[in-house]
Amino acid sequence: RAVPGGSSPAWTQCQQLSQKLCTLAWSAHPLVGHMDLREEGDEETTNDVPHIQCGDGCDPQGLRDNSQFCLQRIHQGLIFYEKLLGSDIFTGEPSLLPDSPVGQLHASLLGLSQLLQPEGHHWETQQIPSLSPSQPWQRLLLRFKILRSLQAFVAVAARVFAHGAATLSP
């Protein structure tokens, strides 16, 4: 594990995997299905979707003082998106295109979350509703919206790990 007993993570490993996540999130976005992009408007996601915010300790000072606050927040987000990508939203009709990187993205989210999960320590994770949207048009649009939210999330996470790898690695 990268965070044995709650000490520092393997920053370089996390940096590499988070950069891969960024690439996959951007490449997955246009490949989740054919749709009319007019719905790709300017609506904001709400606070129910994990964001990395000022009070989460992900700034350089916060990471220096105690990186656990920030890492827990990132871990919660990774689990949130990992569950969504494994849900019926992505597995139900309409089927993903054969060359969609969503499967790889799902596996990489799980991989990074495992790197961050301390041995014998279980961070609280956000509850994901167990019931799926029932209509294909809903799933198709939600895929775009979820991936767009995920892009923003992993971009911030990647910056955190890049900073950690550059300044906090042993």
Epitope: M35, D36, E39, E43, T45, T46, D48, V49, D88, G92, E93, I128, P129, S130, L131, S132, P133, S134, Q135, P136, W137, Q138, R139, L140, L141, L142, K145, I146, S149
Partner: antibody, heavy 121, light 107 residues
Framework: EVQLLESGGGLVQPGGSLRLSCAAS????????MEWVRQAPGKGLEWVSY????????IYADSVKGRFTISRDNSKNTLYLQMNSLRAEDTAVYYC??????????????WGQGTMVTVSS | DIQMTQSPGTLSASVGDRVTITCRAS??????LAWYQQKPGKAPKLLIY???SLESGVPSRFSGSGSGTEFTLSITSLQPEDSASYFC?????????FGQGTKVEIK
């Protein structure tokens, strides 16, 4: 008993605002995706807006986008529709509806009784 | 948007008759079609989902069939309480759209 109960309708002038509420009971509201559907007097049904079960993502019909905002408070088992910049063509009975909670269905299984919104000067 | 066209607009039939309503989609929607019944001043009630699945509690005289672009709702033995408007709805593509409705009257 599974139930949806809308409120907040009324008469409003063009350009005005209204906030509709839909109180849910008899089911675990936070697990369900919800919608608003409207019906102009003597006309057919028109889908208006959708919100994901956690409230994280919303979708709107082109006719209301930028003017209406759907939201929910899962702790209060309530769905909302904030309607701004109302127009005469928004005059309708507004229904909240629940999605069937299975990916192989594709329909609205529970509807409220509706609340009438009249936009007129 | 996918256009849903119902026919006939109105139909009048006697108690015990078999009644059929047709719904046509402007493009293929696979089997993603639902049928609703609406009585005056009331909310719509789901009858059929996924083209042919009967909603729980709906009498077995109601049935749905079809796929692609052409769908039918049948009532095998019309009852007085079936006097209502019937709407089809496609759930395949954004935005979800409804047919204009068919009014069923009892002679």
């Amino acid at each position: 008993e599974v139930q949806l109960l809308e409120s907040g309708g009324g008469l409003v002038q063009p350009g005005g605002s209204l906030r509709l509420s839909c109180a849910a009971s008899g089911f675990t509201f936070s697990h369900y995706t919800m919608e608003w559907v409207r019906q102009a007097p003597g006309k057919g049904l028109e889908w208006v807006s959708y919100i994901y079960s956690s409230g994280g993502w919303t979708i709107y019909a082109d006719s209301v986008k930028g003017r209406f905002t759907i939201s929910r408070d899962n702790s209060k088992n309530t769905l909302y529709l904030q309607m701004n910049s109302l127009r005469a063509e928004d005059t309708a009975v507004y229904y909240c509806a629940r999605d069937i909670p299975t990916s192989s269905a594709g329909a609205f299984d529970i509807w409220g009784q509706g609340t009438m919104v009249t936009v007129s000067s | 948007d996918i256009q849903m066209t119902q026919s006939p607009g109105t139909l009048s039939a006697s108690v015990g008759d078999r009644v059929t309503i047709t719904c046509r989609a402007s493009q293929s929607i696979s089997s993603w079609l639902a049928w609703y019944q609406q009585k005056p001043g009331k909310a719509p009630k789901l009858l059929i989902y996924k083209a042919s699945s009967l909603e729980s509690g709906v009498p077995s005289r109601f049935s749905g069939s079809g796929s692609g672009t052409e769908f039918t709702l049948s009532i095998t033995s019309l009852q007085p309480e079936d006097s209502a408007s019937y709407f089809c709805q496609q759930a395949n593509s954004f935005p979800p759209t409804f047919g204009q409705g068919t009014k069923v009257e009892i002679k």
